[in-house]
Interface confidence: low
């Protein structure tokens, strides 16, 4: 493989081999060149498995506000606009990284945390278990 | 809002009010007590707006592997198993935080980065534009 030399401009650390704690620059670089389509879209309303967005706020976490999707129905909306219970609305979940203040209430030290969030809902064919 | 007193045990920093660079503990705390449902579920196949998962790998990023959803069809799957083009399969997108080495190849300094990922797809009623 290609040898990648250690950058001589790296910050110092007490243990260069295995830092348990690293420096993280909070000037977030945004790779999204376009406006976030999710925010501007109304998919949550137009979907056959519509959802509501619930605000989850935690000042000890970064980002402090996360929007959680909750499916509106157990079933899905059919062509007539009614709920069809032969289909299921289910949440699409994703594991995301957040920063948690640690020790609590400290402005400049954090711990990485993984949390599971529901991003939206999709309509699926149910798994039917037949009793013998 | 509630005033949360500053913890006297906080690490020192040059600018306590607006840290640009913070210390982050890498012992990741996983708040997901159960196995990630997204990974174990087959919603991507059972959905009326099914999707494929594409692997996006970047060793200089954490997480290094991110799975991107791509909707299989423009339309949605109807009760007969056919694609109905009167409906649209659309990606549900979410902005997530990742860590990127900065400066490059440094073992202990990172920058937060926001990227937009497609987590799955949902079936929506199309917006029809009528020409006058």
């Amino acid at each position: 493989g290609i040898t990648i030399p250690r950058n001589p401009g790296c910050p110092n650390s007490e243990d260069k081999n295995f830092p348990r704690t690293v420096m993280v620059n909070l000037n977030i670089h945004n790779r999204n060149t376009n406006t976030n389509p999710k925010r501007s879209s109304d998919y949550y309303n137009r979907s056959t498995s519509p959802w509501n967005l619930h605000r989850n706020e935690d000042p000890e976490r970064y980002p402090s506000v996360i929007w959680e999707a909750k499916c509106r129905h157990l079933g899905c909306i059919n062509a007539d606009g009614n709920v069809d219970y032969h289909m299921n609305s289910v949440p699409i979940q994703q594991e995301i990284l957040v920063l948690r203040r640690e020790p609590p209430h400290c402005p400049n030290s954090f711990r990485l945390e993984k949390i599971l969030v529901s991003v939206g809902c999709t309509c699926v064919t149910p798994i039917v278990h037949h009793v013998a | 809002g509630i005033t949360i007193p500053r913890n006297p045990g906080c690490p020192n920093s040059e600018d306590k009010n607006f840290p640009r660079t913070v210390m982050v503990n890498l012992n990741i705390h996983n708040r997901n007590t159960n196995t990630n449902p997204k990974r174990s579920s087959d919603y991507y196949n059972r959905s009326t707006s099914p999707w494929n998962l594409h692997r996006n790998e970047d060793p200089e990023r954490y997480p290094s592997v991110i799975w991107e959803a791509k909707c299989r069809h423009l339309g949605c799957i109807n009760a007969d198993g056919n694609v109905d083009y009167h409906m649209n399969s659309v990606p549900i997108q979410q902005e997530i935080l990742v860590l990127r080495r900065e400066p490059p190849h440094c073992p202990n300094s990172f920058r937060l980065e926001k990227i937009l990922v497609s987590v799955g797809c949902t079936c929506v009623t199309p917006i029809v534009h009528h020409v006058a």
């Epitope: 990648i4 295995f18 | 890498l26 990741i28 060793p59 290094s64 860590l99």
Partner: nanobody, 119 residues
Framework: QVQLVESGGGLVQPGGSLRLSCAAS????????MYWVRQAPGKGLEWVAE????????YYVDSVKGRFTISRDNAKNSLYLQMNSLRAEDTAVYYC????????????WGQGTLVTVSS
Amino acid sequence: QVQLVESGGGLVQPGGSLRLSCAASGFTFSSYGMYWVRQAPGKGLEWVAEIKQDGSEKYYVDSVKGRFTISRDNAKNSLYLQMNSLRAEDTAVYYCAKGEILPLYFDYWGQGTLVTVSS
């Protein structure tokens, strides 16, 4: 699907040697640092050794320095741990782990191979 499969463990007398292997698949092996981690009976996970992507840099926990050697063969997608002068306290299940850019963080590890050092 990331897969890490360890082999080479077994029963050995104190002072003896073993060579552990780890076959990797499902990811670009040559792009990642790799680790050996171990878990002694009734104890927590302990990091043992790390090797950088190209094998140029290697690091060891103090207790194995001079006795254990980590190596890799990127052409074969394989990781190795040569263990010499084994001691009773080296008895553990040894896991091979895929490194991330975050030091000491492992997203994936194998099922492990048991090393027992006993007379």
